[in-house]
């Protein structure tokens, strides 16, 4: 039950995280005009990964796409790439994790296969989250560098008479959305990996063969590596799954290394 909950929660958290990464990538407010200690202007500038916008106080907003690819800064291209990789990995991870969910039955899929799929999706979510966090952090670093550079020459005098105000940019809402979303995707991925440990079979993938001794019930597994003793074992008829993996509603009556996840 705990495994199912962990897996389900991991899926939901990752889903929210990936939705957030997509939202952040599409948002226009990656960097916004710094209004602190700046002359009050009738326009508000903000920029995204794909276009820059200007909102006039009169209510009009005009956005222009970056219609060049080669003319864009390498850092911006890198951030775009990281965010897209994060989205793609996250989307694939979501697809894989849907089939890996313990509460969803697909044909006669073995629990070991579900465990592998859960681990795969978990790793994908972790990498996706890291990509998003990295992308947002690279952009934030770029902003900080540019901010202090523009602060150094905030006002560039023209012939000592005319002043040109340089627009400074600070962190936009998309950065915070990206950080949170990346973190959620990462957490979801970790939860999926933890859930995978609970789904994984104890030892091998061979069919378990039960030999009933006259004393207490001992289940022998071929290969002779380990014998599990069932203290107070559940006597209900249960289907024996490949590798002796437990069903989701089975009451565990003996401690296992997976009970502590």
């Amino acid at each position: 039950m705990a495994v199912t909950a962990c897996q389900g929660l991991g899926f939901v958290v990752s889903l929210i995280g990936i939705a957030g990464i997509i939202a952040a990538t599409c948002m226009d407010q990656w960097s916004t005009q710094d209004l602190y200690n700046n002359p009050v202007t009738a326009v508000f500038n903000y920029q995204g990964l794909w276009r820059s916008c200007v909102r006039e106080s009169s209510g009009f907003t005009e956005c222009r796409g970056y219609f060049t690819l080669l003319g864009l800064p390498a850092m911006l291209q890198a951030v775009r790439a990281l965010m897209i990789v994060g989205i793609v990995l996250g989307a694939i991870g979501l697809l894989v994790s849907i089939f890996a969910l313990k509460c969803i039955r697909i044909g006669s899929m073995e629990d070991s296969a579900k465990a592998n799929m859960t681990l795969t999706s978990g790793i994908m979510f972790i990498v996706s989250g890291l990509c998003a966090i990295a992308g947002v952090s690279v952009f934030a670093n770029m902003l900080v560098t540019n901010f202090w550079m523009s602060t150094a020459n905030m006002y560039t005098g023209m012939g000592g008479m005319v002043q040109t105000v340089q627009t400074r940019y600070t962190f936009g809402a998309a950065l915070f959305v990206g950080w949170v979303a990346g973190g959620l995707t990462l957490i979801g991925g970790v939860m999926m990996c933890i859930a995978c440990r609970g789904l994984a079979p104890e030892e091998t993938n061979y069919k378990a063969v039960s030999y009933h001794a006259s004393g207490h019930s001992v289940a022998y597994k071929p290969g002779g590596f380990k014998a599990s003793t069932g203290f107070g074992s559940n006597t209900k008829n249960k289907k024996i799954y490949d590798g002796g993996a437990r069903t989701e509603d089975e009451v565990q009556s003996y401690p296992s290394k997976h009970d502590y996840v």
């Epitope: 202007t41 500038n45 006039e56 009169s58 209510g59 005009e62 040109t164 105000v165 627009t167």
Partner: antibody
Framework: QVQLKESGPGLVAPSQSLSITCTVS????????VSWVRQPPGKGLEWLGA???????NYNSALMSRLSISKDNSKSQVFLKMTSLQTDDTAIYYC???????????WGQGTLVTVSS | DIVMTQSPSFLTVTAGEKVTMSCKSS????????????LTWYQQKPGQPPKLLIY???TRDSGVPDRFTGSGSGTDFTLTITSVQAEDLAVFYC?????????FGSGTKLEIK
Amino acid sequence: QVQLKESGPGLVAPSQSLSITCTVSGFSLTSFGVSWVRQPPGKGLEWLGAIWAGGNRNYNSALMSRLSISKDNSKSQVFLKMTSLQTDDTAIYYCARGSYGSSFANWGQGTLVTVSS
Amino acid sequence: DIVMTQSPSFLTVTAGEKVTMSCKSSQSLLNSGNQKNYLTWYQQKPGQPPKLLIYWASTRDSGVPDRFTGSGSGTDFTLTITSVQAEDLAVFYCQNAYFYPFTFGSGTKLEIK
């Protein structure tokens, strides 16, 4: 079509307050900002302040302490209140609709306010 | 506050002539975000409210004849009337539409001979 009409008292005694109403039609105050501009007889234009679509306001720093701009979206009215009037406040007061490039695309006919005892 | 300086104060021309008037601002009106200059030109005929001619320094408002052309960038701007008509008799004002408070130039009065 877009129309703006100012209505004011005409004559105001010195040190008294001035209240002007700008009634608009053809557009919504929730979508467009309205500015107030005045013009003393035979002189140039002076921007007084503005109230924007979202309700935020900007004022001329020289007049900020005496000025107050508000609006009633449902009645399509914008209000200008100015305190402590002096004779040099005698002017034609215009309200104008904000447009692209923070320009004033549509103007009212103006209302002449004379400050005199 | 931004100071807008217009020159000349008066212009007397004959109909059909080309006329140019200047407007200078104390600070650049160029917005780096969209590379647009927030300078506006108005025409005020006697006894009438001002009429918008040009915004963003060079964009004509709808219904404005194409004989009116705005140009310039940063701090120096020009309004050109290619072929002055009798009905162009007016005062032309430039306006800083970038910094608060918005400020107007003192105007250029155009008179027709």
